[in-house]
Interface confidence: low
């Protein structure tokens, strides 16, 4: 039977009676061997109780005394079987054994749940020698018990290659409930059921759970731990916690906020990072996500021109990295740009609209009617063209770029000339005789260089040849420009 000593009980006397061999309780020990120093608590439990010797694990000595009397079996005396106490209290328990003096070097070790207790435990072994036997008392104390001290403690003694094991002493540390699982913060869809879990353990058991929502108890009757609260749905944010009750009192879990998922707030601080003729790079600061991760964003672009048809271009992009390059825009145009982002609930409102402009574009059309002819007397090539039709968005024409490539046997070199905006003709020096000159012209604005015209070729003869008629770009539909001599 388990002897149970509760902390409310008066401690037993340390030694209820003399040990065999007339060892008196007032004997001072001959030798005291502390395993570690430490506070010895006032709270003690009987190390020995009257009764028969333990017979479960005994050593039968083979040695006999001079008179050849057989020695009695060795066994630890019975002790308290079960100690129940509160967390942070002190406890001391012990085991005792009487060993004939013929045995030398007897040591007692303490074991907990099958593992030897080594190191800085408050264990003291005291020896009380008498004429024939030595009473050995091994005490074990814990100054402030914790849950981890729960377990089964035993003493072991090795004699004559035999191991003697005491009855177990069960230590049960009781305290307030301890949470092994607390409710977690969640983001939930409005009016949709969800579960919260709360689990707490003793000892002492049972542990009963009450759920609390916004400081009010949810369940009138407690539930045994573990408890799952099914909340059928919320319409507004709530704070849940659980109370764990046992005989020692109550522990309250952390309060967790259950947020209601909502559509996000609109993005803020939409700004222009870079602008070109046909694209605008924007960035934005996302608004509050409505307790649900952003999935993607939509960039809405409207022409700001009052004469435009008011149509909206929509560009979808991922929510990260809060950056998007809007492409396929017209040059030199004004746009209103807004950003909206969505989560699983829906789309946010559009951000405040911002105005943005594209820059001038490069010309979209090459100069027309390019004509090239050789002026042999001046050793120049004259080039003429017509100004291309420019759209307003292409910006202001600042000039032309002329590419002329000279090719003869083993030689090929390209040269570039810039001509002012009002020009429609140019003259370039002959670079190589007995060679072909290929000319292309492009219009230039601040937005860049437009497309080059189709190439026009002219043959430059060796010195002393007659003038040649001009070469010109072909009419639409012809294949290559024709060199006219």
């Amino acid at each position: 039977a388990i002897t149970e000593a509760r902390e409310e009980a008066k401690p037993y006397p340390l030694f209820p009676g003399p040990f065999p061999g007339s060892l008196q309780t007032d004997h001072t020990p001959l030798l005291s061997l502390p395993h570690a120093s430490g506070y010895q608590p006032a709270l003690m439990f009987s190390p020995t109780q009257p009764g028969r010797p333990h017979t479960g694990n005994v050593a039968i000595p083979q040695v006999t005394s001079v008179e050849s009397k057989p020695l009695p079996p060795l066994a630890f005396k019975h002790t308290v079987g079960h100690i129940i106490l509160s967390e942070h209290k002190g406890v001391k328990f012990n085991c005792s054994i009487s060993v004939p003096n013929i045995y030398q070097d007897t040591t007692i070790s303490w074991w907990k749940d099958g593992k030897e207790l080594l190191g800085a435990h408050h264990a003291i072994t005291q020896f009380y020698p008498d004429d024939e036997v030595t009473a050995i008392i091994a005490s074990f104390s814990i100054t402030s018990v914790q849950r981890s001290d729960n377990g089964s403690y035993i003493c072991k003694m090795k004699i004559n290659n035999e191991e003697i094991v005491s009855d177990p002493i069960y230590i049960e540390v009781q305290g307030l409930p301890h949470f092994t699982k607390q409710p977690e913060s969640m983001n939930v869809t409005r009016n949709t059921a969800f579960n919260l879990t709360c689990q707490a353990v003793g000892p002492p058991e049972p542990v009963n759970i009450f759920w609390v929502q916004n400081s009010s108890r949810v369940n009138e009757q407690p539930e045994k731990s573990p408890s799952v609260l099914t909340v059928p749905g919320l319409t507004e944010m709530a704070v849940f916690s659980c109370e764990a009750h046992n005989d020692k009192g109550l522990t309250v879990s952390k309060g967790v906020q259950i947020n209601i998922k909502a559509i996000p707030s609109p993005p803020t601080e939409v700004s222009i990072r870079n602008s070109t003729a046909h694209s605008i790079l924007i960035s934005w600061v996302p608004g509050f996500d409505g307790y649900s991760p952003f999935r993607n964003c939509s960039i809405q672009v409207k022409e700001a021109d009052p004469l435009s048809n008011g149509s909206v271009m929509i560009f979808n992009t991922s929510a990260l990295p809060h950056l998007y390059q809007i492409k396929q825009l017209q040059a030199l145009a004004n746009y209103s740009i807004g950003v909206s982002c969505m989560n699983e609930i829906g789309w946010s409102a559009v951000s405040p609209w911002i105005l943005a402009s594209t820059t001038e574009g490069a010309p979209s059309v090459a100069p027309l009617n390019v004509t090239v002819f050789l002026n042999e007397s001046s050793d120049n090539v004259d080039i003429r063209w017509m100004k291309p039709p420019t759209k307003q968005q292409d910006g202001e024409l600042v000039g032309y770029r002329i590419s002329h490539v000279w090719q003869s046997a083993g030689i090929s070199k390209e040269l570039l000339e810039e001509v002012g905006q009002n020009g429609s003709r140019a003259r370039i020096s002959v670079q190589v005789h007995n060679a072909t000159c290929t000319v292309r012209i492009a219009a230039v604005t601040r937005g860049g260089v437009g497309p080059f015209s189709d190439p026009v070729k002219i043959f430059i003869p060796a010195h002393g040849w007659v003038d040649y008629a001009p070469s010109s770009t072909p009419a639409p539909g012809n294949a290559d420009p024709v060199l006219i001599i």
Epitope: N191, A193, V218, E220, T230, P232, G233, L234, T235
Partner: antibody, heavy 125, light 112 residues
Amino acid sequence: EVQLQQSGPELVKPGASVKISCKTSGYTFTEYTMHWVKQSHGKSLEWLGGFNPNNVITSYNQRFQGRATLTVDKSSSTAYMELRSLTSDDSAVYYCTRGDLLWSLLLPGNYFDYWGQGTTLTVSS
Amino acid sequence: DVVMTQSSLTLSVTIGQPASISCKSSQSLLDSDGKTYLNWLLQRPGQSPKRLIYLVSKLDSGVPDRFTGSGSGTDFTLKISRVEAEDLGVYYCWQGTHFPWTFGGGTKLEIK
């Protein structure tokens, strides 16, 4: 004796809103959920939604989600059902009915043990 | 949603004779807690509904014992051993197992 006393008949125009009340007595109001059931003329019953007066949790039939709002006034032990954007399809008798003990809005249960006398709603221009 | 089907729209009976009303659900009403939340209501003419039976067969207080409920899974029956005049009205079955709670179309009990 448990009693659920509902407000009188309503005649409203399409697009408008209506708020029906259900005053309870004879039991502890905050210990039971309160539900609303619609019965169209000559037709069966349809659960509209439920409300837990203790913790202000609501639950709706998907068909009425967004248009119906259930509220309570604990001090007077009265439940309310507001229905918005009314159409002629909303013309029906609406009943309040008592549900199970505490926070069982979505849990299986033996609801609807006591019923109000019904409020007739007519939506007509 | 679970569909509750009451095959008979009208049942004509003679006073003192037995009556039987059937109700079928589109899925089993046996809950994981081992209970079957099938309930019966009676709506007398011009009145609000009144619960007669819950959990398939349990009679509400004040309901005469001539009413019995039976069935399991998806098939359920309400029986009246001897119909009395006060039993006339529309009988509805409804389920409280699967959210949202749904009602049968009703069976009208009338005098032959």
